[in-house]
């Protein structure tokens, strides 16, 4: 047996992080996002749960809704009606999937200072929102959409087709929620509140995933979810628009699907209102390399929405799939005709384009060997966007302003030089027409949120600077974080290395690779974090590395689309390449290298362990995908095509973890999964375990009863990280 090695950080003034610190969330940070209610006014929920109104220009602030009112119904969230007469209070939050939840809603009348009685809302509600003007309410209850002209009125029932696990109106089914919309809702008000657009998802023919939920009863419950796996029948989707001014005078009007899309299986991908009587729908072929953006207009004389062919814009990828993770959405100009959109340029970098008539005639607005990430706001004279251009670091985000009123348009980086060392990764929140905006910096230093003037970009005030966190970290020995790149052949890989305090290049350290590696993901980001791997570096003296290999985002399509139709190959190869490079650096103990990952990262870590290279002593896979046939159609097929003989079945079969069961013989493998994982089904780990048993390969496993993909209940999470820590320390011969 190798003697145990104990890592002792030197210097006694500061203490190392403990696992308890991480599990208790002792060093979590705060951000401040204003809830904008006008060009210069916003709301914010205070620490003590008062809802406070702020006017930037008059400097006025007052409590609009007291914490006692919130407490009276146990409210955890709120929403002010645009006419400022009512507030909805949300309570009894009950999580469903990643974004979806149900809740009880109460309407509080700010004028009268009392709750609205009469025609109270049913419970639990699946989604509720105010119209953009006035105080109309749209809500979804039992998969049907209802409308109230005012909170105290009886509702109009807009849809009647809703049925549990069959037909969903105004809310997505499982696969659309997780893989397409990334929202809990599928309804959108027109800007003036006249129309309400919504999607109907018909899941009647979708196969059901069923799993046991053990609970406390004598018999387990069975959870049934319509869940299309790769190649299975998909939801049938239709988009309708209802005139909410006269809901019984005109029924919901269906929006036609573009012919080139409707000719085979397709997806709805997003809806954007352009003006009060113009809407933009985005559609995607099931083979997700063709996207169509369709602009439709209301024809009052026909009571119909017309989507002329000359208002269809096609986006196609010849090297992979359309878009990044999702197809980007358009940001329309004031003229309600032209728009700005991010898509790949001729060099394969995602950039902002201006489309006036056809995509072919698009004018490229940004260019370079970097990528535009997101368009925040388009005003009369400015376009605000984020990119990773600055200093050539793909893992940074800065906010830029293009003055589109000028000819030629001029570009300015709003954030690049604000707090250069502390802040390299920003997002922003703009008031309606960008008169003011908040910047939220996520790191690499302590996060800070600030308020700015939209015309001059001047900082007006600091909204949150995490002073308490700064103070509590003063006596903590934090590891050193480096973000660098390594080259191999013609490829460049960015990596983040977390080095133990008092790191000494002349010594040898155990190495843990943390991997995600999914298509269009990014792990190497200039953000602040104090988490499990921070603790491992700080207290246990482990070097941590994260590497963005091929298939990861924001470095051009050549790098991104390298994994198209062959998942599980280059992602793994690039992690192995990086490990070899790290060994060459001289401070890694080759005998003590591990890899771990969750979800897609669990898949990659499993394949890396089974690569037969002998690089890894041990590794952990949490909730891994084990075969792309077991995962959701929209995701799997986006990157792998269909699991059919005439398409890509061969690689679906070749890329499973099970196919490599024999290769786990010489590594220590810890396999972990929640039994109530609605996303990456327990089936994935069950099949890995079965294959390992059949191959007579020893391994360790842990399941978490009734836990989902996040294994996030307090007790389970504590157990999980404690268990993984023990496993790693044992693997690295670190004493407890």
């Amino acid at each position: 047996l190798r003697p145990s090695r104990v890592y002792k950080p030197e210097g006694n003034t500061k203490r190392a992080l403990t696992l308890k610190d991480i599990l208790n969330g002792t060093f979590s940070y705060k951000t401040y996002f204003p809830n904008w209610i006008s060009e210069q006014e916003y709301l914010h929920q205070s620490e003590d749960d008062n809802i406070v109104f702020y006017n930037i220009e008059t400097r006025e602030s007052y409590i609009i809704l007291s914490n006692s009112t919130m407490k009276s119904v146990n409210a955890t969230d709120y929403g002010l009606s645009p006419d400022r007469q009512f507030v909805y209070l949300e309570s009894d939050y009950s999580k469903l999937w990643r974004y979806s939840y149900t809740a009880t809603y109460y309407i509080y009348d700010l004028q009268n200072g009392e709750f609205v009685r009469g025609y109270e809302l049913p419970r639990p509600i699946q989604y509720l929102c105010w119209s953009p003007v006035g105080s109309k309410l749209a809500y979804v209850y039992q998969n049907n959409i209802y409308l109230k002209q005012r909170p105290g009125d009886p509702p109009f029932q807009i849809t009647y087709t809703g049925r549990e696990n069959r037909i969903f109106n105004g809310i997505p089914d499982w696969v659309y929620e997780e893989e397409m919309l990334a929202t809990k809702y599928a309804l959108w008000w027109s800007p003036d509140g006249k129309f309400l657009a919504y999607v109907e998802f018909n899941d009647s023919d979708i196969p059901i995933i069923a799993y046991s939920y053990y609970g406390d009863g004598q018999y387990p419950r069975t959870i049934n979810i319509p869940y299309p796996k790769a190649g299975a029948k998909n939801p049938v989707v239709r988009v309708f628009i209802v005139d909410t001014t006269y809901p019984h005078h005109v029924g919901p009007m269906e929006v036609p699907v573009p012919e080139m899309i409707a000719s085979s299986d397709y997806y709805f991908s997003w809806l954007t209102w352009v003006s009060s009587e113009r809407v933009c729908l985005q559609w995607l072929k099931r083979v997700q390399n063709v996207s169509v953006l369709s602009i439709c207009d209301f024809r009052e004389d026909w009571h119909a929405w017309e989507c002329p062919k000359n208002q269809e814009h096609v986006e196609e990828s010849r090297t992979g799939w359309a878009g990044g993770f999702f197809v980007s959405t358009p940001a329309f100009s004031q003229d309600a005709t032209s728009y700005y959109k991010i898509f790949s340029d001729k060099d394969g970098y995602k950039h902002i384009h201006y489309i006036k008539d056809t995509v072919e005639n698009a004018i490229q607005i940004t260019s370079g060997k970097w990528e535009a990430i997101y368009i925040f706001r388009v005003t009369q004279d400015s376009l605000f966007y984020s990119s990773n251009e600055f200093e050539g670091y793909p893992g940074r985000r800065n906010i830029y302003r293009i003055s589109i009123g000028n000819s030629p348009p001029s570009k300015k980086c709003v954030t690049c030089h604000l707090r250069k060392e502390r802040c390299q990764y920003y997002t922003a929140s703009f008031s309606y027409k960008a008169k003011y905006y908040a910047l939220v910096c996520y790191g690499p230093g302590l996060p800070i949120s600030t308020l700015h003037d939209g015309r001059t970009d001047q900082e007006i005030q600091v909204l949150e600077e995490n002073k308490e966190l700064e103070n509590s970290l003063r006596n903590i020995q934090l590891p050193k974080v480096e973000i660098k790149k390594l080259k191999d052949g013609g490829l460049t890989f960015w990596y983040k290395m977390i080095l133990p305090p008092q790191f000494d290049r002349s010594k040898k350290y155990p190495l843990l690779i943390q991997v995600y590696g999914g298509p269009c993901s990014q792990s190497v980001k200039s953000v602040f974090a104090v988490n499990w791997i921070t603790y491992l570096a700080s207290k246990e003296g482990i070097v941590i590395a994260l590497v963005d290999g091929r298939g990861t985002a924001f470095q051009g399509d050549k790098f991104l689309h390298a994994v198209y139709r062959k998942l599980g190959v280059y992602e793994v190869e690039d992690q192995l390449t990086a490990v070899r490079k790290f060994i060459e650096m001289g401070f890694i103990d080759e005998e003590r290298i591990a890899i771990w990952g969750w979800s897609y990262g669990g898949y990659v870590s499993s394949l890396a362990l089974a690569s037969g290279t002998g690089l890894f002593k041990c590794g952990i896979a949490v909730a891994p995908v084990s075969s792309w046939e077991y995962y959701a159609s929209i995701y799997s097929e986006r990157f792998m095509g269909l699991p059919t003989k005439d398409d890509n079945l061969e690689h679906y079969k070749n890329s499973t973890v099970m196919a490599r069961a024999e290769y786990f013989r010489n590594v220590d493998y810890l396999l972990i999964h929640g039994t109530a994982d609605d996303n990456v089904h327990f089936q994935n780990s069950a099949q890995i375990a079965k294959a390992l048993v059949n191959a007579q390969v020893d391994f360790q496993a842990m399941w978490y009863s009734d836990q989902n993909h996040g294994i996030s209940s307090g007790r389970s999470q504590n157990h999980l990280y404690t268990h993984m820590t023990h496993f790693l320390k044992q693997c690295f011969s670190l004493s407890d």
Partner: antibody, heavy 125, light 107 residues
């Protein structure tokens, strides 16, 4: 007082067309939808469609697709309903009725509060 | 489309009786229901809107109740002029639909 006055009875042959008028008085004509409803002998009511006099926009029931046309004349505060390709089962009393909800506001249904006296249309060969 | 079903189709009653007519919607319509009275050879007259609101000028012996799918029109004390046919109408969703009618006759 508010009233709707309809044109007189009509006898038509199958395949022909009929136009029924409905003149409004005693209120602001543009502010209220006018609906057309028919009642076959000894039967209940069948809703046919509506016109928004303010905009001239119409909408009708699926059953009358392509056969019914509703128009209005703002100068005389009159709406017209034309039914084409008449069949014997179109024999009925045709009513115009005012919708109490306002065309200019978010919709609340208060009912059809003012009705015309009815126009008997007989379709017979 | 939503169907409206009234019951009974006819009722015989005497002056002073309490008469109840029910109307059932094939799907929920909240409170978007109106009641009409029609006498032979005449146009209908609006009695009740929004399920329970009395139209102005209508005697208070008429009342409406219900929400969702089940609704009731009650005449608390039948008067000679109340002998007529009564119709319900839904206005929750397109197209508006009427019940088939309930005839109140003299016993």
């Amino acid at each position: 007082q508010m009233q709707l006055v309809q044109s007189g009875a009509e006898v038509k042959k199958p395949g022909a067309s009929v136009t029924v008028s409905c003149r409004a008085s005693g209120y602001s004509f543009a502010d209220h939808f006018i609906h057309w409803v028919r009642q076959a002998p000894g039967q209940g009511f069948q809703w046919m469609g509506w016109i928004n006099p303010n905009r001239g926009v119409t909408h009708h029931a699926q059953d009358f697709q392509g056969r019914v046309a509703m128009t209005r004349d703002m100068s005389t505060d009159t709406v017209y309903m034309e039914l084409t390709s008449l069949r014997s089962d179109d024999t009925a009393v045709y009513y115009c009725a005012r919708d109490e909800s306002l065309t200019a506001r978010p919709y609340y249904f208060y009912g059809f509060d003012v009705w015309g006296q009815g126009t008997l249309v007989t379709v017979s060969s | 489309d939503i169907q409206m079903t009234q019951s009974p189709s006819s009722v015989s009653a005497s002056v002073g009786d309490r008469v109840t007519i029910t109307c059932r919607a094939s799907q929920g319509i909240s409170s978007w229901l109106a009641w009409y009275q029609q006498k032979p050879g005449k146009a209908p007259k609006l009695l009740i809107y929004a399920a329970s609101s009395l139209q102005s000028g209508v005697p208070s012996r008429f009342s409406g109740s219900g929400s969702g799918t089940d609704f009731t029109l009650t005449i608390s004390s039948l008067q000679p002029e109340d002998f007529a046919t009564y119709y319900c109408q839904q206005a929750n969703s397109f197209p508006p639909a009427f019940g088939q009618g309930t005839k109140v006759e003299i016993k």
